[in-house]
């Protein structure tokens, strides 16, 4: 006999990276017929929603109107059908950005490279941080973590045309409080692929959210819960 229901999906809209003082909605999708959803923050009950009518609703939204560092952290949700509770969702890491300062991002040997060359990004931030994150825009982007007193190195490659794109970096004051994004660096990769290794398999996060962090019009993005979920769960591990 089944003791628990399948775990729900959890994700953030428009994005799990939220500029301070901006709004964000945490979504939890369970099953039709669920009479109660609970949102947990850092292991404690944070909010409850009871959809009406439950048989017509399989998703609830928890609205945060004003993002700040106190609201940043790990969220999970569960739902109940009758007396039976679900497994908890995966953890959603909700990150507050645009805190304090702006890092600078540079790329060596330069922004225009030839396929097969090795590339290193350097992210620098003079304020008190020791963790840095390099993110590439786009649906199948890459996230790298680096450490250093005021700057971190992010080796890439040998590059292929798959590495083309726009990169930004953040300084991280803690796992869930990030700096402003750096100015973008656009990496251009030209030439044939000559015995190069494939791009590294890093966690992905969905499409273009820079500047205003608004959701793009890409179809199906809001339904791509597993991708959001996977990113939020793995980005900071």
């Amino acid at each position: 006999q089944q003791q628990t229901l399948p775990k729900p999906f959890i994700w953030a809209e428009p994005h799990f990276m939220v500029p301070k003082e901006k709004q964000v909605t945490i979504c939890c999708q369970g099953n039709y017929g669920a009479v109660e959803y609970q949102l947990h923050f850092e292991g404690s009950l944070f909010a409850v929603d009871r959809p009406k009518p439950p048989e017509r609703i399989n998703k609830v939204q928890f609205y945060i109107p004003d993002m700040n560092s106190r609201m940043a952290g790990q969220y999970s949700c569960i739902y109940r059908v009758g007396e039976l509770w679900s497994e908890p969702s995966n953890l959603l890491d909700l990150v507050v950005t645009e805190m304090y300062d702006t890092p600078t991002l540079s790329v060596h040997p330069g922004p225009e490279v030839i396929s097969g060359e090795k590339v290193t990004f350097y992210c620098r931030l003079d304020t008190a941080t020791s963790m840095f994150l390099l993110l590439k825009e786009g649906r199948s982007s890459h996230v790298q973590r680096g450490y250093g007193k005021v700057q971190a190195e992010f080796p890439l490659g040998p590059v292929t045309t798959a590495h083309r794109g726009t990169y930004r970096c953040f300084g991280s004051y803690n796992n869930h409080a990030w700096s402003f994004p750096s100015e973008p660096v656009k990496l251009l990769v030209t030439g044939d692929i000559e015995n190069t290794s494939l791009a590294p398999e890093d966690p992905t996060f969905p499409a273009d959210t820079w500047g205003t962090y608004l959701l793009t019009t890409e179809t199906g993005l809001q339904k791509d819960h597993a991708l959001w979920d996977h990113t939020a769960q793995n980005l900071l591990r």
């Epitope: 600078t104 396929s115 097969g116």
Partner: antibody, heavy 115, light 107 residues
């Protein structure tokens, strides 16, 4: 065209410091890495470190971290390398070289450490 | 630190001869390799970047290639001004490192 101007020579006392200059022209100074390279008489080339003038990002070879300090003055498009606590081992020609791929080289400054 | 082992350290050859210099990388450097030429007065000039791309103004007799971790500079027909020093340089990973150099001498 790209030019990197370095003084021909510097004579310094042991234990003193020296600040070498490299004046850049013919390109956007803040958009390219500037590397520094050492060559002792009759020896090969050794990379010291690099600086990105647009952001002051620096990167040093571990063995030069306590010896060399790289800085830039973007208003005059000049890169500097300060060498401290000089000994006879620091007597060498020092080159500045532009771009992540070491595309253009200065003529080098001969530093002689002598009492 | 990536070691660049350059060979030979010196080479005697005749005008018009074809010669090859080699650098072996101790770790993967992709195509991030330069060949540099140094004149007796100390002037340094880049000949080849990214393993095989020829710098503008460099004669076509110079070419670069790669086979696995071995990188080669070939001069197809030696001219008198080619009898100088040559260095390879990897810029894949810091600290960036040079080969020990090759002194090309006229036979």
């Amino acid at each position: 065209q790209v030019q990197l101007q370095q003084p021909g020579s510097e004579l310094v006392r042991p234990g003193a410091s020296v600040k070498l200059s490299c004046k850049a022209s013919g390109y956007t100074f803040t958009s390219y890495w500037m590397h520094w390279v050492k060559q002792r008489p009759g020896q090969g080339l050794e990379w010291i470190g690099t600086i990105y003038p647009g952001s002051d990002i620096t990167n040093y070879d571990e063995k030069f971290k306590n010896k060399a300090t790289l800085t830039v003055d973007t208003s005059s498009s000049t890169a500097y390398m300060q060498l401290s606590s000089l000994t006879s081992e620091d007597s060498a020609v020092y080159y500045c070289t532009r771009d992540g791929r070491f595309a253009n080289w200065g003529q080098g400054t001969l530093v002689t450490v002598s009492a | 630190e990536i070691q660049m082992t350059q060979s030979p350290s010196s080479l005697s050859a005749s005008l018009g001869e074809r010669v090859s210099l080699t650098c072996r990388a101790s770790q993967d450097i992709g195509s991030s390799l330069n060949w540099l030429q140094q004149e007796p007065d100390g002037t340094i000039k880049r000949l080849i970047y990214a393993t095989s791309s020829l710098d503008s103004g460099v004669p076509k007799r110079f070419s670069g290639s790669r086979s696995g971790s071995d990188y080669s500079l070939t001069i197809s027909s030696l001219e008198s001004e080619d009898f100088v020093d040559y260095y390879c340089l990897q810029y894949a990973s810091s600290p960036y490192t040079f080969g020990g150099g090759t002194k090309l001498e006229i036979k």
